[in-house]
């Protein structure tokens, strides 16, 4: 949602968190701002304090309940407002009618671990975190491997078009240090986006067997 010169973007993690970023050109300095959430069909409402992440943007997390509680559904609409204090009053800076399951961004996958490693291949598994049971198997993943002398941006993306919480990396170089990351995205939602990348998992392939004399 855009008001004046501001931009207000929020995502639902599918369980009990709405994360918001508000950016504004020539924004007010030393001003207290909050995001207020008012669902249309729930008894609760929630507020979080916007904290600066750069000179002209602020972020906060609306914690709706315990991490794995299912606080919203696809039929909910949540009115989200950015309110800033001016004098003793609050002034509305931005507003949007937020459809949580149209604006999904899951938590980064967790618990990455090497299941099996060889000279040229490595089997890695992970878990999804705080993802709604509503998705059933309707998730996809992207993975990337960091090779020596390269950057993450140069790493080719591997796509897993199903809910598959493991991957077998092939054609690796023996006795080489690699890093691996994965991210997840539900298939649902017009404005749904990829989760953040997972914490990198470092692993080393096994050295090639020494030739016999």
């Amino acid at each position: 949602a855009v008001n004046g010169t501001s931009r207000f973007t929020c995502f639902y993690n599918s369980r009990a968190n709405i994360s918001c970023v508000w950016s504004q050109d020539g924004a007010l300095q030393d001003t207290s701002c909050q995001v207020h959430a008012w669902p249309d069909r729930r008894r609760w409402n929630q507020t979080c304090e916007l904290l600066p992440v750069s000179q002209a943007s602020w972020a906060c997390n609306l914690i709706l309940g315990t991490p794995d509680s299912q606080k919203l559904t696809a039929v909910d609409i949540v009115t989200l407002r950015v309110m800033c204090r001016e004098g003793v009053r609050w002034r509305m800076m931005a507003i949007q009618d937020f459809k949580p399951f149209e604006n999904l961004r899951l938590m980064a996958p967790i618990s990455l671990q090497v299941v099996h490693v060889e000279t040229h291949r490595c089997n890695i598994s992970w878990k999804i975190s705080q993802a709604s049971h509503y998705f059933e198997r309707h998730l996809e993943f992207e993975a990337r491997t960091l090779s020596p002398g390269h950057t993450w941006e140069e790493a080719p993306l591997m796509t897993l078009k199903q809910k598959q919480e493991w991957i077998c990396l092939e054609t690796l170089t023996p006795d080489t240090q690699y890093e691996f990351q994965v991210r997840v995205k539900p298939l649902q939602g017009e404005f749904t986006t990829w989760s953040p990348w997972s914490q990198p998992l470092a692993f080393r392939t096994k050295p090639a067997a020494l030739g016999k004399d």
Epitope: N3, T5, S6, E86, V88, W90, M92
Partner: antibody, heavy 121, light 112 residues
């Protein structure tokens, strides 16, 4: 019916203080802001600042900072404005006015009848 | 502080005729949320001010439709389409976009 009833006229000596009260009725006192505006004789209107009775938070116009104090007593739905170190230029009618806690549309919708403060030696 | 300048200072009008009051701000009063918090208050003789118009052109409840507001940026106008006897008084513009909020000096409307 929303009403703001202010205390009566005051005559003060230079250097003294005056405390004007504003009793609210017809609405929930702690849901709205009380602004104070003054009007010197034959002059225009001047916004002095305001108080939110819900938490007692105040904001004062820089022009009056250090001399003005706004308070409230929620038990009797009354707001107060005290102005100290009075000088002749403070001779004016002082108004309280109600405003929404969220400034969505307008600053002040209902006004008190005004309190005349005369500063004279 | 934003200075609000009103013209004319005094406006003699004939009953039933239109009247127009101008208000100019020393800087743009579009708030950073995109709204313009320009209000008009009427003060009849011996009475407290009364809200007429808010956010440039919206009439407050109970305000007759002969009152209208217009303008943008720094230039604003209050119009009375047909002046009635009860419209006599002083009219103030007010900006609520930039704290401290400020009033114009007032325009006195009187019957010729």
């Amino acid at each position: 019916e929303v009403q703001l009833v202010q205390s009566g006229a005051e005559v003060k000596k230079p250097g003294a203080s005056v405390k004007v009260s504003c009793k609210a009725s017809g609405y929930t006192f702690t849901d709205y802001v009380i602004s104070w505006v003054r009007q010197a004789t034959g002059q225009g209107l001047e916004w002095m600042g305001e108080i939110y009775p819900g938490d007692g938070n105040t904001y004062y116009n820089e022009m009056f900072k250090g001399r003005v104090t706004m308070t409230r007593d929620t038990s009797i739905s009354t707001a107060y404005m005290e102005l100290s170190s009075l000088r002749s230029e403070d001779t004016a009618v002082y108004y309280c006015a109600r405003g929404s806690y969220t400034y969505d549309n307008y600053a002040m919708d209902f006004w008190g009848q005004g309190t005349t403060v005369t500063v004279s030696s | 502080d934003v200075v609000m300048t009103q013209t004319p200072l005094s406006l003699p009008v004939t009953l039933g005729q239109p009247a127009s009051i101008s208000c100019r701000s020393s800087q743009n009063i579009v708030h950073s949320n995109g709204n313009t918090y320009l209000e008009w208050y009427q003060q009849r003789p011996g009475q407290s001010p009364r809200l007429l118009i808010y956010k440039v052109s919206n009439r407050f409840s109970g305000v007759p439709d002969r009152f209208s507001g217009s303008g943008s940026g720094t230039d604003f106008t209050l119009k009375i389409s047909r002046v009635e006897a009860e419209d006599v008084g002083v009219y103030y513009c007010f900006q609520g976009s930039h704290i401290p909020w400020t009033f114009g000096g007032g325009t006195k409307v009187e019957i010729k």
